[in-house]
Interface confidence: medium
């Protein structure tokens, strides 16, 4: 049988044969500096202690140095995302050193065995960094470790073992199984670098979460709540493969973290912004679109360094493909009810009209339920930049599309048979743009007509910059 190293093994693990490695001439961990833009080109293998080779490989001591660390592999080969990331880094940082940490022989194992090898690989990366630090011009502050899946935890071990502090570690959907809830020295954690930023794209509360759910960095960004990524449903992946299986969905969602990072490198003119929020549900309600006190940040390469005392969980919505950027809006709608309507569950849609473009018809996602005689907050997002908003069309969906809705309507009719004319009144909509932080107020076109009922629409025109209205002495509830 095969001996295993536990992630919490002692430093003497160096001297053991890592789990499941065949005794071949190939080094179990190689450091390949990518000098060519051509992914087919082998690059140049660095050798710890060989300064001449460092020179021959064109290593630039004063430039930024990126170490790309792959994760577990069942194929034993580099996946296409790695080449995309290499070329995106080379394009963005022309003078930088881009080093691929090739630990394929140790990663091409049973997942659990690959996990048990992460510590020893982290030690090897730290060893290489310690040797580089002996060179006068080399600065650990210029080092950025980028680890995907298991590679994120390798980066964590490297940052933990290195003498000094690495400038930055980016965790791209750090692996979950065997790391969730682990001690900070046995997984990626904020202590591992001066700045640790993390993208979580495959977290699940049911089944097995392939990506780690817990926050592990200074900032932890959960695109689309960190779970269901647009463009990764079975229907989406079925089109491109002979047999669509859950594995393709897993790969799509897990790997989405890499593509979001690549997007931040190649589409720097279209940065995606994430917003601090305590949880995904509050974000879905549109409560968390504030940029005050470092509450928002760019995602990926352009993330601003934030070393909070507490971990910062951040959320955003994205498109299904590159460029991933969307435009977030918070909508505050005060719903008045003049009739005793009982419990109603209206289905609202909005269309936003702007100086640049008009949005599609967007559903207002009701996370809990519409509160009557209260202000309801919603999150809407558009794929295109609408420019300055001019007007809003609010529609209450009429004819029910499902038997469930028909039943709800029938039930609510039975409870109030003498009041079939269901009606709500909305005088204005307050909108805040996440990307510009601009606040606008929209009033009904006809101040006399503020009522809306199923199958009807209501038009709102911009009536004020900002949110405070005449006769209002205090602002509405502040954003967190």
């Amino acid at each position: 049988s095969i001996t295993t190293l536990r992630p919490q093994g002692s430093l003497r693990d160096e001297h053991h044969k890592p789990t499941g490695v065949p005794a071949t001439a190939r080094p179990s961990v190689a450091f390949n500096i990518r000098t060519s833009k051509d992914p087919e080109q082998e690059g140049c293998n660095l050798s710890l202690g060989d300064s001449k080779l460092l020179e021959n490989c064109g290593f630039n001591m004063t430039a930024k140095t990126f170490f790309i660390i792959h994760g577990w592999t069942m194929s034993g080969m580099f996946e296409s995302w790695l080449h995309k990331l290499v070329s995106a880094l080379q394009m963005r940082e022309k003078d930088a050193n881009v080093v691929v940490v090739d630990w394929l022989p140790l990663a091409h194992q049973l997942y659990t065995d690959a996990v048990n090898n992460t510590r020893v690989v982290g030690q090897r990366v730290a060893g290489m960094l310690d040797w580089l630090q002996e060179k006068e011009e080399f600065s650990l502050g210029n080092v950025h470790l980028i680890g995907y899946s298991l590679g994120a935890h390798v980066a964590g071990y490297a940052g933990n073992f290195v003498k000094g502090t690495v400038g930055r570690i980016t965790g791209l959907d750090p692996a979950g199984p065997m790391f969730e809830g682990a001690d900070i020295h046995k997984r990626l954690s904020p202590d591992d670098a001066d700045f640790v930023d993390v993208l979580h794209t495959y977290t699940r509360s049911f089944g097995l979460s392939i990506g780690i759910q817990m926050p592990v960095g200074h900032i932890d960004i959960y695109p689309n709540g960190g779970d269901f990524q647009p463009g990764c449903g079975l229907n989406d992946v079925l089109g491109s493969i002979a047999y669509g299986t859950i594995t393709e969905v897993v790969k799509c969602e897990h790997e989405r973290a890499v593509h979001l990072f690549v997007d931040s490198l190649v589409n720097q003119d279209k940065p995606s912004f994430a917003f601090q929020c305590t949880d995904s549900n509050r974000f879905k309600k549109g409560i968390c679109l504030s940029c005050r006190k470092n509450r928002c940040n760019s995602i990926g390469y352009n993330a601003k360094k934030m070393r909070n005392k507490r971990n910062s969980k951040m959320y955003l919505k994205t498109r299904a493909g590159m460029p991933f950027r969307v435009y977030h809006y918070q909508m505050k709608i005060h719903v008045f009810s003049y009739k005793n309507m009982g419990e109603i569950e209206p289905t609202f849609y909005v269309t936003l009209y702007g100086t640049n473009a008009d949005s599609q018809t967007l559903p207002l996602e009701i996370v809990e339920r519409i509160e009557q005689n209260a202000t309801n907050t919603f999150l809407v997002y558009t794929e295109e930049d609408l420019g300055d908003l001019l007007k809003i069309q609010l529609t209450w969906e009429g004819a029910s599309q499902s038997w469930y809705n028909l039943w709800k309507e029938f039930r609510s009719y039975l409870s109030q048979p003498r009041n079939p004319g269901r009606e709500l009144n909305i005088r204005r909509i307050r909108v805040k743009s996440g990307e510009t932080q601009r606040k606008l107020t929209f009033c009904t076109e006809d101040p006399e007509n503020t009522s809306i009922s199923p199958g009807r629409e209501l038009w709102f025109r911009k009536c004020r910059d900002g949110w405070r209205m005449k006769n209002e002495t205090s602002p509405t509830v502040e954003l967190p």
């Epitope: 049988s1 095969i2 295993t4 789990t19 499941g20 069942m74 194929s75 034993g76 080969m77 091409h108 049973l110 997942y111 659990t112 065995d113 048990n116 199984p177 065997m178 097995l208 392939i210 493969i241 002979a242 047999y243 299986t245 594995t247 393709e248 897993v250």
Partner: antibody, heavy 119, light 107 residues
């Protein structure tokens, strides 16, 4: 849906060899590892080894490395296990099963092939 | 190799009963514990993976729990079709090993 169809029962003489097959359908063949498991009559299950068609990667249980040889034919989406130098100890039902990544479980099983070694 | 022990090789219960089958590993297996059902005709099915996750299509009366070295499978409301042999398996490290099995029969 995922299916693993195994070859029929075999009656073989001691010292001979036998080749069992496991034909996969309903999923991308090269993306999943196929495992083989042995069950002697009225007994428990023993893991023999795996074959990963994506890279022709093979792992054996130390106990079976001189007994079993795993191969595959990608064109027919079939994984084979050859058992050599058969003895009565090799009389058993042999199952093939598909590995689920990350969880290290066997989510789909073939119906089993009974091998009887008898003079 | 990691030894997997199912102390109860045979278990009798009545329909509607709550049944618990246990499994012990010779070392910590970090929740990499799976449960299989082998029906009388020899068909093998995965029930529970990674200690407590229900495989698709498996009735919710089956549940799993445990950590470290001790794990269990519970059937909350025994039905006729549950009469089978149940095996645990560790997927923590190679070689994968199985428990000896627990044969469940009707009283």
């Amino acid at each position: 849906q995922v299916q693993l169809q195994q070859s029929g029962a075999e009656l073989v003489k001691p010292g001979a060899s036998v080749r069992l097959s496991c034909k996969a359908s309903g999923y991308t063949f090269t993306k999943y590892t196929i495992h083989w498991v042995k069950q002697r009559s009225g007994q428990g299950l023993e893991w023999i080894g795996w074959f990963y068609p994506g890279s022709d990667s093979i792992k054996y249980n130390e106990k079976f490395k001189d007994k079993a040889t795993l191969t595959a034919d990608k064109s027919s989406r079939t994984v084979y296990m050859e058992l050599s130098r058969l003895t009565s100890e090799d009389s058993a039902v042999y199952f093939c099963a598909r590995h689920e990544e990350y969880t290290n479980s066997l989510a789909y099983w073939g119906q089993g092939t009974l091998v009887t070694v008898s003079a | 190799d990691i030894q997997m022990t199912q102390t109860t090789s045979s278990l009798s219960a009545s329909l509607g009963d709550r049944v618990t089958i246990s499994c012990r590993a010779s070392q910590d297996i970090s929740n990499y514990l799976n449960w299989y059902q082998q029906q009388p005709d020899g068909t093998v099915k995965l029930l529970i993976y990674y200690t407590s996750r229900l495989h698709s299509g498996v009735p919710s009366r089956f549940s799993g729990s445990g950590s470290g070295t001790d794990y269990s499978l519970t059937i909350s409301n025994l039905e006729q079709e549950d009469i089978a042999t149940y095996f645990c398996q560790q997927g923590y490290t190679l070689p994968w090993t199985f428990g000896g099995g627990t044969n469940l029969e009707i009283k």
